[in-house]
């Protein structure tokens, strides 16, 4: 839009807002059980972990903000089996952490998730 | 879980992680048109804005993280009507910003959205 019609400061604020909404890795709360694939008798404590996942807007409505690079970070969680026959076990769970994002036209066939050791 | 079984530092790290995943207002990217209710001939630029929305985990699976208090913040956006007969108009769009969140058992009847002036 032509800058001549509007106050340059207003345009700057709008532009900064747009930049902040762009597709990038954002800290997200992820439910471990859902990511792992729910098992009715296995629970985790805490049930959620913080990781970075791609999110935000793209320059085109038809594009999807998706991860292009991923690192796996290990989270220490209590694994609880029901019925509780033993002490909850402290296990390392590897969670996908998106380190790079890109606006892409199609969803990948194999979305990154969680790897259990 | 009894702290005697585990290293106190490990427990502290787990607890901090859990606190950070708790239900609270989080900065979120929101698509304005979707929030407003899509009109085929009215578009916004930028199409997305940053606001705080309730998100995160609850202690029980049956609870949902929902807003208990909301403020409305005004965002300056270009409103584009199609077919484009005039210069895109700079309009104030009021967007719901969640200021308080709580883990509640049911979804509210009227989710907060966007108010147009």
């Amino acid at each position: 839009f032509a800058a001549t019609f509007y106050d340059i400061e207003t345009l700057k604020v709008i532009d900064e807002e747009w930049q902040r909404t762009q597709c990038s890795p954002r800290e997200t709360c992820v439910e471990v059980a859902s990511e792992l694939g729910k098992s009715t008798n296995t629970f985790f404590k805490p049930p959620c972990v913080n990781v970075f996942r791609c999110g935000g807007c793209c320059n085109e409505e038809s594009l999807i903000c998706m991860n292009t690079s991923t690192s796996y970070i290990s989270k220490q969680l209590f694994e609880i089996s029901v019925p509780l026959t033993s002490v909850p076990e402290l296990v390392p769970v590897k969670v996908a952490n998106h380190t790079g994002c890109k606006c892409l036209p199609t969803a990948p066939r194999h979305p990154y998730s969680i790897i259990r050791r | 879980f009894a702290a005697t079984f585990y290293d106190i530092e490990t427990l502290k790290v787990i607890d901090e992680e859990w606190q950070r995943t708790q239900c609270s207002p989080r900065e979120t990217c929101v698509e304005v048109a979707s929030e407003l209710g899509k009109s085929t001939n009215t578009f916004f630029k930028p199409p997305c804005v940053n606001v705080f929305r309730c998100g995160g985990c609850c202690n029980e699976e049956s609870l949902i993280c929902m807003n208990t208090s909301t403020s409305y913040i005004s965002k300056q956006l270009f409103e584009i009507s199609v077919p484009l007969t005039s210069v895109p108009e700079l309009v104030p769009v009021k967007v719901a910003n969640h200021t308080g969140c709580k883990c509640l058992p049911t979804a509210p009847r009227h989710p907060y959205s966007i108010i147009r002036r």
Epitope: F1, D15, N59, E61, P105, T106 | K45
Partner: antibody, heavy 118, light 112 residues
Framework: QVQLVQSGAEVKQPGASVKVSCKAS????????MYWVRQVPGQGLEWMGY????????TYNQKFKGRVTMTTDTSTSTAYMELRSLRSDDTAVYYC???????????WGRGTLVTVAS | DIVMTQTPLSSPVTLGQPASISCRSS???????????LHWLQQRPGQPPRLLIY???NRFSGVPDRFSGSGAGTDFTLKISRVEAEDVGVYYC?????????FGQGTKLEIK
């Protein structure tokens, strides 16, 4: 108003490279993807790829992958398209086109004729 | 790649009469988000293409209301209610649902 001003016509030898520029004005350059489309004289339109000026991310048509590079200079609001290893069938008018959030190529440059001949 | 097939390739029309161009895609153009990214472009002789219609039926800025777009899935139509002399040129359909973006081969509109 939105304007896309392209560089002038070029004549190149087979095997050489060409770099076409497209200077944008009248809008926020980083808020829109820039497409590159070519048209062989008397023929239809062919999409080469696009660049997101916000972060430099590119998506190319597989047909041109390895031969084409799209870049931007946000300080001057200019997009560039470089095509390498030119062949005679690359003789075409090369257009830059801004793409709206809703998908249509809404503003076009006037085109740059690239002639490849020995 | 998505193949876009236009018919007819040439359309001689009398001034003031209607004209219709068809565009068929080799795959559905409905995006996973529910939108259909099918657009129509006009290219007058010696000029760059110009956007007429986007997302099937939305007329772009300054496009006369005699132009209209319709269709769904794989079959789309551009209609001109009353052809005027300035409408002479080549019309292209294009899709931006899939990569690579592709165009129809063009339909030449000429006056009888």
């Amino acid at each position: 108003q939105v304007q896309l001003v392209q560089s002038g016509a070029e004549v190149k030898q087979p095997g050489a490279s060409v770099k076409v520029s497209c200077k944008a004005s009248g809008y926020t350059f980083t808020g829109y993807n820039m497409y590159w489309v070519r048209q062989v004289p008397g023929q239809g339109l062919e999409w080469m790829g696009y660049i997101d000026p916000y972060n430099g991310d590119t998506t190319y048509n597989q047909k041109f992958k390895g031969r084409v590079t799209m870049t931007t200079d946000t300080s001057t609001s200019t997009a560039y398209m470089e095509l390498r290893s030119l062949r005679s069938d690359d003789t075409a008018v090369y257009y830059c086109a801004r793409t709206s959030y809703y998908g249509g190529m809404d503003y076009w440059g006037r085109g740059t004729l690239v002639t490849v001949a020995s | 790649d998505i193949v876009m097939t236009q018919t007819p390739l040439s359309s001689p029309v009398t001034l003031g009469q209607p004209a219709s161009i068809s565009c068929r895609s080799s795959q559905s153009l409905v995006h996973s988000n529910g939108n259909t990214y099918l657009h129509w472009l006009q290219q007058r002789p010696g000029q760059p293409p110009r956007l007429l219609i986007y997302k099937v039926s939305n007329r772009f800025s300054g496009v006369p209301d005699r132009f209209s777009g319709s269709g769904a899935g794989t079959d789309f139509t551009l209609k001109i209610s009353r052809v005027e002399a300035e409408d002479v040129g080549v019309y292209y359909c294009s899709q931006s649902t899939h990569v690579p973006r592709t165009f129809g081969q063009g339909t030449k509109l000429e006056i009888k």
